[in-house]
């Protein structure tokens, strides 16, 4: 993702509560940083349908975060 000026998060608003698993191409997690003070879960959709932000408080987001953290650490 390109860098934005300090204090600007990539996601706007609270995000969707869930995305159909079959529609997910990739999930990216952006951890709090100088650019944004909150965790952001960004879903890339299949068939070039763009990206959506997942509400980080949602059940699906928590599952994705756990899965990614297990894989990375």
């Amino acid at each position: 993702f390109p860098m934005f000026k300090r204090g600007r998060c990539l996601c706007i608003g609270p995000g969707v509560k869930a995305v159909k698993v079959a529609d997910i191409e990739k999930a990216s997690i952006m951890y709090p940083s100088n650019n944004c003070d909150k965790i952001e879960v960004i879903i890339t959709l299949k068939e070039n349908k763009g990206q959506r932000c997942l509400n980080p408080k949602s059940k699906q987001a928590r599952l994705i975060i756990k899965k990614v953290e297990r894989k990375n650490f």
């Epitope: 600007r8 990539l10 706007i12 608003g13 609270p14 995000g15 879903i43 990206q51 932000c53």
Partner: nanobody, 126 residues
Framework: EVQLVESGGGLVQAGGSLRLSCAAS????????IGWFRQAPGKEREGISL????????YYADSVKGRFTISSDNAKNTVYLQMNSLKPEDTAVYYC???????????????????WGQGTQVTVSS
């Protein structure tokens, strides 16, 4: 059923003001970002302003910055666009749209918005 209904358009002289309203039903504003777009004859739909009611963040296109102000009344489930110092080039049909899970990268991409109103005509005469 989700519905967005715009009102407040009309004919105004250059330099004048109008306030557009976007009444939402079937969902709460806190769950969505609400944007205003406009489309002039023969031109593409242009995103001009957006608000996220959950935290009150606002965004403006350069073409309206300093002249237009977006606000929301969560109790009325309504978003407003106060338009001041109107110019003839502001003449267009104005639409409000609702998006969930929007990214800053695709702020003004119409296809990223889930619901649209029917539009209200704004005409600015010189």
């Amino acid at each position: 059923e989700v519905q967005l209904v715009e009102s407040g358009g009309g004919l105004v002289q250059a330099g004048g003001s109008l306030r557009l309203s976007c009444a939402a039903s079937g969902f709460t504003l806190d769950d969505y970002a609400i944007g205003w777009f406009r489309q002039a004859p023969g031109k593409e739909r242009e995103g001009i302003s957006l608000i996220t009611s959950d935290d009150g963040s606002t965004y403006y296109a350069d073409s309206v910055k300093g002249r237009f102000t977006i606000s929301s009344d969560n109790a009325k489930n309504t978003v407003y666009l106060q338009m001041n110092s109107l110019k003839p080039e502001d003449t267009a049909v104005y639409y409000c749209a609702a998006a969930q899970g929007l990214l800053l990268l695709s702020l003004w991409v119409p296809t990223q918005y889930d619901y649209w109103g029917q539009g209200t005509q704004v005409t600015v005469s010189s």
